[in-house]
């Protein structure tokens, strides 16, 4: 993790996670990159590519659509979320080009790194409210009849948005360049002030808040939707909820290396060999957490196109099918079983 | 023209303290750049102990981390240099030296240091 | 640590000669050498920094070469002043650290 102390008696280890490559020894010993910096380079340029043209053409398509459109709301919310990190990376590559040397000043240092960050819990808040939404669809389709609308859909967007921004100021506050002279170069990360505590606090929050407890929260809430839709349903197409486990599962799994190795640098010492090698994994774990930026997208195309590999529309239309279906409850006022199962079976949110 | 100046003791006893004062004239040790003190044994090896930077972080060889300490009067221009449990071994010249980056710019006269009962 | 190696301890020259000193590094030191001259007085003064460059004041008969782990600096005309001890260091990675010099004297 990019942390480091201004009064450290040693080198300590240059990297929070939120940056890539501070508190440890500054190793451009030779003009050649690590392997797992190659590899983040490799990484970063596929996202950005596919992540802003994706998340380009998802907002594109939801923005005409989110009006009257639910799903298309919690789509657009979550693209530009991807989107807005997939901005930081050009940056983020240049900087590990250049051993991480940060020449783009302290405000980019404060706000481009942490936009992961906003982007982790963006999506995660992002992706409990659908789930919550998803879940009222099948347990409450009564009250998503009266209450169920667009207003009260941007509220929670707002407030997901709003607790995000929040979540991510310890980042934003702590992060700082320094100037190191051998090499010369400029760092940028996070500085703790030599309190070892508080930088525990900061990843244990980011652990608990940003993966494990909405892991177990969405758990239990997908397994109680999976029991109900199957348990009500005879001609099973579990089409959405591919498309929602799928979208959900990529968030854990590509969030898990950064979080396991930020909890596990936080409570190790910046000179101990696992710390050194979990430093040297840094900018691989913060640009496997970046795939996220650029995988739902993928997943919409692969939904799209009903999971056989061939595309039989052009992008826009196949993925203003997939984002933009609304569910049942918004139509029908008369309210059957069926409906609630047909409702739950063809709602595409995530 | 920035100059730098060192003084110290010039004779210590084993096992004891010694400090080492560099005094910066002609520019401030808070504007910029990192302030030095490095060391020349009598077989003329030169070995670098560490720094203070314009911004007050400090960096220091890790053969002598656990004896060293490097601070700083910015009201005076001054940075400081404290060795504990001296030996023999630390017998030298100690220079203080400005770095812009990556190499030593300009250095002080010295100050001879001998350790000795 | 990066060790800096001068294999020559001491060489005697005449004035007016060409003088080269080597020095090596034991792993690739990227551009970050640097050259020192410190006189009988044990004045030490900066020469040459990121292998060639010359740093202000520093008479143009002086010059620096290399790449990777090896690296020498030249002195096209030896002049009495430069008589003196040199020493090579790598600025890549912490802790810098400097070459055992080499001495220039007179023949």
């Known amino acids: 993790m990019d942390s480091f102390n201004y009064t450290t008696p040693d080198y300590g280890h240059y990297d929070d996670k939120d940056t890539l490559d501070l508190n440890t020894p500054v190793d451009k010993t030779s003009n050649t990159l690590r392997v797992p910096d190659i590899l983040a380079l490799v990484i970063f340029a596929v996202v950005f590519l596919v992540g802003v043209l994706g998340n380009a053409l998802v907002v594109w398509v939801t923005a005409f659509e989110a009006k009257r459109t639910i799903n298309a709301i919690w789509f657009l919310n979550l693209a530009v979320a991807d989107f807005l990190s997939c901005l930081a990376l050009p940056i983020l590559f240049t900087s590990i080009v250049q051993h991480h040397h940060w020449p783009f000043g302290g405000a980019a240092c404060s706000i481009l790194p942490s936009l992961i960050l906003l982007n982790m819990y963006a999506s995660i808040l992002l992706l409990a409210t659908i789930s919550a939404d998803r879940f009222l669809l099948v347990f409450k389709p009564i009250w998503c009849q009266n209450f169920r609308g667009a207003g009260l859909a941007w509220i929670a967007c707002a407030v997901a948005w709003g607790l995000a921004l929040l979540l991510t100021i310890p980042s934003f506050l702590y992060r700082v360049v320094r100037e190191e002279y051998f090499p010369p170069k400029v760092l940028c990360g996070v500085d703790y002030s030599h309190d070892k505590r508080r930088e525990r606090a900061v990843a244990i929050v980011r652990l608990v808040l940003g993966f494990l407890w909405p892991l177990l929260t969405l758990t239990i809430c997908y397994t109680f939707i999976l029991l109900r839709t199957w348990s009500r349903r005879a001609t099973r197409s579990t089409k959405t909820l591919k498309v929602v486990v799928a979208v959900v599962a990529s968030f854990f799994i590509f969030w898990l290396p950064y979080q396991v190795t930020g909890i596990m640098m936080s409570f190790l010492e910046p000179s101990s060999p696992t710390f050194l090698l979990l430093k040297k994994l840094d900018s691989l774990c913060v640009s496997f957490a970046y795939i996220n930026c650029c995988i739902n997208p993928i997943i919409y195309v692969v939904a799209g196109q009903g999971f056989q590999g061939r595309l039989r529309k052009s992008l826009p239309s196949l993925l203003r099918n997939v984002l933009t279906e609304e569910s049942v409850v918004r139509e029908s006022k008369s309210f059957t079983r069926s409906t609630v199962d047909t409702m739950a079976q063809k709602t595409q949110a995530v | 023209d920035v100059q730098l100046q060192e003084s110290g003791p010039g004779l210590v006893k084993p096992s004891q303290s010694l400090s080492l004062t560099c005094t910066v004239t002609g520019y401030s040790i808070t504007s910029d750049y990192a302030w030095n003190w490095i060391r020349q044994f009598p077989g003329n090896k030169l070995e670098w102990m560490g720094y203070?930077?314009?911004?007050?972080?400090?960096r220091y060889n890790p053969s002598l981390k656990s004896r060293i300490s490097i601070t700083r009067d910015t009201s005076k221009n001054q940075f400081f240099l404290q060795l504990n449990s001296v030996t023999t071994e630390d017998t030298a010249t100690y220079y203080c030296?400005?770095?812009?980056?990556?190499?030593?710019?300009?250095w002080g006269q010295g100050t001879t240091l001998t350790v000795s009962s | 640590d990066i060790q800096m190696t001068q294999s020559t301890s001491s060489l005697s020259a005449s004035l007016g000669d060409r003088v080269t000193i080597s020095c090596r590094a034991s792993?690739?030191?990227?551009?970050?050498l640097n050259w020192y001259q410190q006189t009988p007085d044990g004045t030490v003064k900066l020469l040459i920094y990121q292998i060639s460059r010359l740093h202000s004041g520093v008479p143009s008969r002086f010059s620096g070469s290399g790449s990777g782990t090896d690296y020498s600096l030249t002195i096209s005309n030896l002049e009495e002043e430069d008589i003196a001890n040199y020493f090579c260091q790598q600025g890549n990675s912490l802790p810098p650290t400097f070459g055992g010099g080499t001495k220039v004297e007179i023949k």
């Open positions: 030296a400005i770095t812009t980056g990556g190499y030593f710019d300009y």
């Open positions: 792993q690739d030191i990227s551009n970050y």
């Open positions: 203070i930077s314009y911004s007050g972080s400090i």
